[in-house]
Structure formats: C-alpha cells, structure tokens
Interface confidence: low
C-alpha cells in the first residue's frame, strides 16, 4: 500500500546550469494524498536555509504528482546557490534534498567555466 506521507522528490546532488537573464522555473515535485501541504522554498546560506518569502511561486497540478515552483523572472547572477523546498504536513516539517543552480552571467557566457572548474574553484561563478 502506498504511503500517505508527503514526499518531496528532489534528488540528492541535482543541479541546473542556467544563464543569467533567462526565465527559469525551479520545480519541487510533491506527492500527497488528501490535503495539499504548505510548501516553501529556502536558499542555503552556510548551515542555515533562508526562507524565500517575497519570491513568486506557484503550483502546477498533474495527475500523479504536483509541483511547487519557484519562479526566476529573470535569473540573476546572485541566484547562484543551493535551494531546498520544505513541506508542513500534520505538524511535521519535511525537507527536500538541496538542488543547486549554477548561474553563468551572460556577459561571460562565451568563456563559461566547466562544471569541474566550478566545483573546485567556485569563485569562477562570480566573474
């Protein structure tokens, strides 16, 4: 029998390489049985995750899964970083794994660093 606990399906180590200036939708896949949980997005800052309260979000409902979407309109260079969605369900807080946005500034897209470079030399992200 399928569990009726809320499930957040962001996979460990998931990542997106995106360009500054483009629109982007960051999806948090959510499964629930009856009442849709309250879901929020936060951005990791060191050991804390700062809640994104003033950002545009929306729900996209599908037949077997729903998506809580964080909208970037457009993506900005400082949107680079790791994000997590969280759901409040029956007084429990359920947290997703983090997903990382690698933002390349359009101005330097022609000299875009490789993922290996970005991992080992993160300052390249802010050129």
């Amino acid at each position: 029998k399928e569990s009726c606990d809320v499930q957040l399906y962001i996979k460990r180590q998931s990542e997106h390489s995106i360009l500054a200036g483009d629109p982007f939708e960051l999806e948090c896949p959510v499964k629930y049985c009856a009442n849709r949980p309250h879901v929020t997005w936060c951005k990791l800052n060191g050991t804390t995750c700062v809640k994104l309260e003033d950002r545009q979000t929306s729900w996209k409902e599908e037949k077997n899964i729903s998506f809580f979407i964080l909208h970037f309109e457009p993506v900005l260079p400082n949107d680079n970083g790791s994000y997590r969605c969280s759901a409040n369900f029956q007084s429990n807080l359920i947290e997703s794994h983090s997903t990382t946005l690698y933002v390349t500034d359009v101005k330097s897209a022609s000299e875009r660093p490789s993922k290996d470079e970005m991992a080992s030399r993160p300052w390249l992200l802010y050129r």
Epitope: E2, S3, D5, Q7, Y9, K11, R12, Q13, S14, H16, E25, E27, P29, K31, E62, K63, N64, I65
Partner: antibody, heavy 120, light 108 residues
Framework: QVQLQESGPGLVKPSETLSLTCTVS????????WSWIRQPPGKGLEWIGY???????NYNPSLKSRVTISVDTSKNQFSLKLSSVTAADTAVYYC??????????????WGQGTLVTVSS | EIVMTQSPATLSLSPGERATLSCRAS???????LSWYQQRPGQAPRLLIY???TRATGIPARFSGSGSGTDFTLTISSLQPEDFAVYYC?????????FGGGTKVEIK
C-alpha cells in the same frame, strides 16, 4: 498499457552524434519523468539521464558534457543526442519511464532497446 | 557516485532451489531507494522490487527483498524455469542513479 519504442540509426561513425527518439504510446508523456539507459554488449546498465515533460533534465556526470535529452510533448516523444561518440558508446540504448513511488524512483516501463554500433 | 557491487557474478542452481543474490553499496543507502530488476536474454529489464522490499505490480510472491544500510538481498524462494536470468540492483539515493553489475542466475 504504456509502451515505449526507441528509433534511430543502428550505426554511427566515430566522432559523430548519436540521435535516438523514444515514442510513448498508450499514455501521455506529461506528468512523468523519462530516462535513457544504456547497456554495452555483455555488460551492465548505465543511467544516462532523465527529463520531465516541462524540460527539466539531469544527466549522468560521466556523460554530461556530451548528452542532450529533449522532449516533444506534441508528438509524445523524447530524444537523446550523444556527441563525439567512440566505440565505447556501442550499446543497447533503452528508454524508460520513471515512476515516483512513495519510496523513491524506479523504472517501471521500458522500451525493447535498440542496438547502436559505433564504427567507421 | 555510489558504486553498487553484486555477488556472486553467476549463481548456478536447479529449478525449485532457493536463490540468494547480494547487492552492496559503496556508502549507506536508505532502504527506500533500492530497486531490483530482472533481465531475460534479449529483453529489456523488468522492475521486480522497489523500496528494498515492495514487489512491483504483477511480480510473484516468490520474489522478496530485504536489507538496509549498505547490504541488500534479493531472494527467490523456489526458482521457476522463467526465473533464470540476470538480476540488477539500482540505487536512487544519490544522483547519478547507478546499477550493480548484475548477477546471472543459470540452470545447474
């Protein structure tokens, strides 16, 4: 009953781009994640990447620099492109549907697979 | 990435015997994220077990899964002729999703 069918050339020259399409019938491509998985002759399975119908993708880091997965919802198809192929890319390529159980991700429907040989 | 190692590589058994297949992960994997597949010659893999122990739709009760942490087991209680095939474990605890190298169950 959901069915998946891979199509594309069975022979690709070294350094060229391998292109395959998976056609989904018996169900909509919407609301699910879809994957490509390959199997070199006589060897095990290797996950290539997945795509959601909205276009969200994730790729295996070992192939990421050469892989593009795209989706065409109007045709109920998703596609794989693998660039700069070598003999090591010779394999049976499978497309598969990702099912989101409450416990995690598995592949519940598979295509029959198509053998792609890289040779000049 | 998480490396999945299956043993033995080949298991030679007779119909009616019990088969025990092992899958070991290079790091701890939550039991929620471990699946098993069967692949018969010339066919695509078929999902048998997900979440370590839950049988997929239409899978006979003679197939069972167990384990936790880094060690997982697929058991076939009484081998039927159609069970002689290659079996793969797969983890989705971390990306990239990875499969074991497979265990071939052959007729003795």
């Amino acid at each position: 009953q959901v069915q998946l069918q891979e199509s594309g050339p069975g022979l690709v020259k070294p350094s060229e781009t391998l292109s395959l399409t998976c056609t989904v019938s018996g169900g909509s491509i919407s609301s699910y994640y879809w994957s490509w998985i390959r199997q070199p002759p006589g060897k095990g399975l290797e996950w290539i990447g997945y795509i959601y119908y909205s276009g969200t993708t994730n790729y295996n880091p070992s192939l990421k620099s050469r892989v593009t997965i795209s989706v065409d919802t109007s045709k109920n198809q998703f596609s794989l492109k693998l660039s700069s192929v070598t003999a090591a890319d010779t394999a049976v390529y499978y497309c598969a549907r990702v099912v989101l159980y409450s416990t995690g991700w598995s592949f519940d429907y598979w295509g029959q697979g198509t053998l792609v040989t890289v040779s000049s | 990435e998480i490396v999945m190692t299956q043993s033995p590589a080949t298991l030679s058994l007779s119909p009616g015997e019990r088969a025990t297949l092992s899958c070991r992960a290079s790091q701890s994997v939550s039991s929620s994220y471990l699946s098993w597949y069967q692949q018969r010659p010339g066919q695509a893999p078929r999902l048998l077990i997900y979440g370590t122990s839950t049988r997929a739709t239409g899978i006979p009760a003679r197939f069972s899964g167990s384990g936790s942490g880094t060690d997982f087991t697929l058991t076939i209680s009484s081998l039927q002729p159609e069970d002689f095939a290659v079996y793969y474990c797969q983890q989705d605890y971390n990306l990239p999703l990875t499969f074991g190298g497979g265990t071939k169950v052959e007729i003795k």
